[in-house]
């Protein structure tokens, strides 16, 4: 019987010889559960597993805890890969996180964290980040130390308000913090002075809602 080849992330897909961008099926070791993820095989050497993408407002990101846990959307377009998969993956080896951003004026920038992982669901998928470099701000727009994940039905932030309901989307909200890449998608010329847009403060400042975002991870030793 031929052994089934499975890949835990896009780095393994890349190393197996599949070097074309696209949607691939990933499976964690010792698991039968599969997820479909978009693999970027070109940017910065390839092997990037896309865990979030915003590009046109076609997908609703105001979702429940369970939806953010298992993932939603379309891996070829706007989607969230899923907190459970990302948590398990990033606790098996060391990963870097790259966040690529686009504004409405044709500019692009990125933030690269040299170590990224999510805690377990029991710890509310708290984000852990170390070692920021890149062009999207010298200060991390994801609050440090990292916060628990919050959604419209799971209020784990540090605010007297409910950030996920006020700003929309699931995120590692503080009170509410300098970023929310899962906020409301606003079209061009309607994207400023927004209280609930797609925000990365230390690049574009307050109230500016971005055109596009991609969050991607790759093993640190790739």
């Amino acid at each position: 019987k031929e052994e089934q080849i499975s890949f835990r992330d896009c780095a393994e897909v890349f190393k197996s010889g599949h070097t074309t961008n696209g949607v691939y099926t990933l499976t964690l070791p010792n698991s039968t559960e599969e997820v479909k993820a978009y693999c970027d095989m070109e940017a910065g050497g390839g092997g990037w597993t896309i865990i979030q993408r915003r590009e046109d407002g076609s997908v609703d990101f105001q979702r429940t805890w369970k939806e953010y846990k298992v993932g939603f959307g379309n891996p070829s377009g706007e989607y969230w890969l899923g907190n459970e998969f990302v948590s398990q993956l990033t606790n098996q080896q060391r990963y870097v996180l790259k966040i690529h951003l686009k504004d409405w004026e044709g500019n692009e920038a990125y933030s690269l964290y040299e170590h990224f992982y999510l805690s377990s669901e029991e710890l509310n998928y708290r984000i852990h980040l170390k070692g920021l470099t890149g062009t999207a701000g010298k200060i991390s727009s994801i609050s440090q130390p990292g916060n628990d994940f919050s959604t419209k039905d799971a209020d784990n932030d540090k605010c007297i308000c409910k950030c996920s309901q006020m700003l929309t989307g699931g995120w590692w909200f503080d009170a509410c913090g300098p970023s929310n890449l899962n906020g409301m998608y606003y079209p061009q010329r309607q994207n400023t002075n927004k209280f609930n847009g797609i925000k990365w403060y230390y690049w574009k400042g307050s109230g500016y809602s971005l055109k596009g975002t991609t969050m991607m991870i790759r093993p640190a030793d790739f």
Epitope: I160, C161, A175, K194, F195
Partner: nanobody, 129 residues
Framework: EVQLVESGGGLVQPGGSLRLSCAAS????????IGWFRQAPGKEREGVSA????????YYADSVKGRFTISSDNSKNTVYLQMNSLRPEDTAVYYC??????????????????????WGQGTLVTVSS
Amino acid sequence: EVQLVESGGGLVQPGGSLRLSCAASGFTLDDYAIGWFRQAPGKEREGVSAIRSSGGSTYYADSVKGRFTISSDNSKNTVYLQMNSLRPEDTAVYYCAAVPAGRLRFGEQWYPLYEYDAWGQGTLVTVSS
């Protein structure tokens, strides 16, 4: 559409007074805090004063305490900054900005700069003889 429009800036002699206005539209002051900020050439933007109309709470930076007074007229959806005993170091572009009043960290009274998501274009205040 959320808009903030500042007015009232100008040239004034040291010791003089000005009253800045911040007219808000697209939201009501009841649910928001309004802050006044200033930025002098080559310097960082800094918080000057803020008000939560609903509870009447106010905040002042140490550098303006006793000289500046913030107030609001909810019927006009406008916030004012009365500036007395002006000094040359008060010279700056003054901005007003808004933040949902509830966006507060447990145990804290006021908001970091990055929480203010709506901003006006600013009004220039020059204090010079």
